[in-house]
Interface confidence: medium
Amino acid sequence: ATKLTEEKYELKEGQTLDVKCDYTLEKFASSQKAWQIIRDGEMPKTLACTERPSKNSHPVQVGRIILEDYHDHGLLRVRMVNLQVEDSGLYQCVIYQPPKEPHMLFDRIRLVVTKGFSGTPGSNENSTQNVYKIPPTTTKALCPLYTSPRTVTQAPPKSTADVSTPDSEINLTNVTDIIRVPVFN
């Protein structure tokens, strides 16, 4: 099996993890998508998921996790705000396609959260705190808590990640508090 690779994010407490999970637009636009954590020796645990079918540009918030699925860009945006040290771990985006196994998107995310310089959350990241406020109107979707253990060891198919590019601005239609729009789609 192909070795699964990881992309590592080293952040401080209080900061925001902001990642993009790109998918093949034609195949998966309306499919339900999820953000999972993978702990050693355990099945991937779903922390948040989009609605079923997934709605375009409609924020879904579960605690400090916000998911936004942009069908026209083939992009699931995942944000974890106000990070805590205990958020450290291995994460992945998946697409639910029952009865088949969930389809994993791109490399996994290795998140390492450390204490802020002054020990106070967000002490070195006030800009992100201001920019990525939690949307005032969000939906909480129901999703399977765990997926099959096969997802842990299964190699991903040849990349379907639409790893995108600079300068494709996304209009975040239901997110009134976001001041700036990311440049990459």
């Epitope: 994010y9 902001d18 790109d22 590019t165 494709s168």
Partner: antibody
């Protein structure tokens, strides 16, 4: 292994045209949006243009808008940059680039192709 | 567009020394969208840091990034001979994506 190989550079007179190509391999090209970035001799880097995976979204730097056209052929795993009305200030090494899997930075670059605009 | 100003323009140091490179943005940039690149003569740029502080695959841990808002820093803890090159910062927070003018790290 991701590989990006540019070609098509050369010497052209002001007002002339040139078409650059970028051959991609080692990844599913049709699933990735792509970019052109250039670097004038002895100068810094400048983003030029980008195109989404299905060509639905196309963007240009103001300095090339109306003169350059980005396109792609997913069946051939190729990215193109058609450059018209070339000016001396377009002289540069042109790179095709792809961002990382989940972050907004150019992780993969070609070796570049030199375009010289001179009379 | 966001203008990124890098300083100093040239840094003259010896192998083993610590290098501190600065990148200042004309307006606030979320750290998720700030990257650093290394470029050697005749070569394409190489991604070092993304998200202001995360090292790209294969980058030695002597390279580290930090900062937020308008001020970002790339630090090379102990310069190796292969580290002498030009370094660029780049933002992808506001369209168009822009690069700093570069800092050349040369051997003293």
């Amino acid at each position: 292994e991701v590989q990006l190989v540019e070609s098509g550079g050369g010497l052209v007179k002001p007002g002339g045209s040139l078409r650059l190509s970028c051959a991609a391999s080692g990844f599913t090209f049709s699933s990735y949006s792509m970019n052109w970035v250039r670097q004038a001799p002895g100068k810094g880097l400048e983003w030029v243009s980008s195109i989404s995976s299905s060509s639905s979204y196309i963007y240009y730097a103001d300095s090339v808008k109306g003169r350059f056209t980005i396109s792609r052929d997913n069946a051939k795993n190729s990215l193109y940059l058609q450059m018209n009305s070339l000016r001396a200030e377009d002289t540069a090494v042109y790179y095709c680039a792809r961002r990382g899997g989940s972050y907004d930075a150019f992780q993969h670059w070609g070796q570049g192709t030199l375009v010289t605009v001179s009379s | 567009e966001i203008v990124l100003t890098q300083s100093p323009g040239t840094l003259s140091l010896s192998p083993g020394e610590r290098a501190t490179l600065s990148c200042r943005a004309s307006q606030s940039v979320s750290s998720s969208y700030l990257a650093w690149y290394q470029q050697k003569p005749g070569q394409a740029p190489r991604l070092l840091i993304y998200g202001a502080s995360s090292r790209a695959t294969g980058i030695p841990d002597r390279f580290s990034g930090s900062g937020s808002g308008t001020d970002f820093t790339l630090t090379i803890s102990r310069l190796e001979p292969e580290d002498f090159a030009v370094y660029y910062c780049q933002q992808a927070f506001i369209s168009p994506p822009t690069f700093g003018g570069g800092t050349k790290v040369e051997i003293k």
